[in-house]
């Protein structure tokens, strides 16, 4: 039995972050506020400028369950969400308008880094507690998928996109946000 799929009840999003950044200043402004709206004079794609792209992260909190067993402590992790695109071209909170070219490359926000965490499970009926290892999403990243490539092949975003990835095993993280649940791994 695997973990129950979580229900994504998060209500706000935060800008994409590296694995362990400094907390942003208190007065920082997010890119999807109205004051950042308005179409810029020109908006070329520049795959080399990683800073121009934005990947949104949600956090959520839940208890993990495995059948009748439940984690002794709740966990928190990230869910990768939203449309990746040049930061200045992301839709603002009012218009919800996409300004990037419809025939441009497709960008996806998917898990990038994971953190392994050992979790204690408490089971009913006086059963002994169990220990399991789970993988929790630690950061998200934009990946590029062009129309000229196989739809299932996600390319790393940034300067390394030109490198072919043949022979590379697909990571389990390359899934939709709704599948970003903690995964059981063999802990025995």
């Amino acid at each position: 039995q695997g973990w129950q799929a979580f229900r994504n009840d998060a209500t706000e999003v935060i800008p994409g972050l590296g694995e362990y950044p400094e907390p942003p200043p208190e007065n920082n402004q997010t890119m999807n506020r109205a004051e950042n709206g308005g179409r810029p004079p020109h908006h070329p794609y520049d795959a080399k400028d990683v800073s121009e792209y934005s990947c949104r992260e949600l956090h959520y909190t839940r208890f993990l369950t495995d059948g009748p067993c439940r984690s002794a402590k709740p966990v928190t992790e990230l869910v990768c969400s939203g449309q990746c695109g040049p930061a200045r071209l992301l839709p603002n909170a009012i218009g919800r308008v996409k300004w990037w070219r419809p025939n441009g490359p497709d960008f996806r926000c998917i898990p990038d880094r994971y953190r392994a965490q050992r979790v204690q499970l408490l089971c009913p009926g006086g059963a002994a507690p169990r220990s399991r290892k789970v993988r929790l999403v630690a950061s998200c990243k934009c990946k590029r998928l062009t129309r000229f490539h196989n739809q299932s092949e996600l390319k790393d975003f940034g300067p390394e996109t030109a490198r072919p990835q043949k022979g590379r095993k697909p990571r389990p993280g390359a899934r939709g946000a709704k599948a970003n649940q903690a995964e059981l791994e063999n802990a025995y």
Epitope: T11, P15, Y20, H59, S71, V75, T76
Partner: nanobody
Framework: EVQLVESGGGLVQAGGSLRLSCVAS????????TGWFRQAPGKEREVVAS????????YYADSVKGRFAISRDNAKNAVYLQMNSLNLEDTGVYYC???????????WGQGTQVTVSS
């Protein structure tokens, strides 16, 4: 070692409001989430709401959406839970906890009792 102290609990009539506070000290985590949890008599502890270190990301359990609001004041190392339209099902001990993101909630306060009467 993170220490968390909750306050603001008490007895309130159904439909009323309360504001809980959680003050942290000794924090060493750089990227963390603070959550509120509650436990009613004879029931398991459940998630109420959580908020990221910057205050920009929040999460609410379905049962409290639209009624509760979580916020934080990093200058005071405090997290608040504004509870409105309280009902009998909101009765319980409310705990504040912190977790590294991602990770388990390893740091817990002692809890504050909230009792909603009819």
């Amino acid at each position: 070692e993170v220490q968390l102290v909750e306050s603001g609990g008490g007895l309130v009539q159904a439909g009323g409001s309360l504001r809980l506070s959680c003050v942290a000290s000794g924090r060493t985590l750089r990227r963390y989430v603070t959550g509120w949890f509650r436990q009613a008599p004879g029931k398991e502890r459940e998630v109420v709401a959580s908020i990221s270190w910057s205050g920009e990301s929040t999460y609410y359990a379905d049962s409290v959406k639209g009624r509760f609001a979580i916020s934080r004041d990093n200058a005071k190392n405090a997290v608040y839970l504004q509870m409105n339209s309280l009902n009998l099902e909101d009765t319980g001990v409310y705990y504040c906890a912190e977790a590294e993101l991602p990770g388990t909630y390893d740091y817990w306060g002692q809890g504050t009792q909230v009792t909603v009467s009819s």
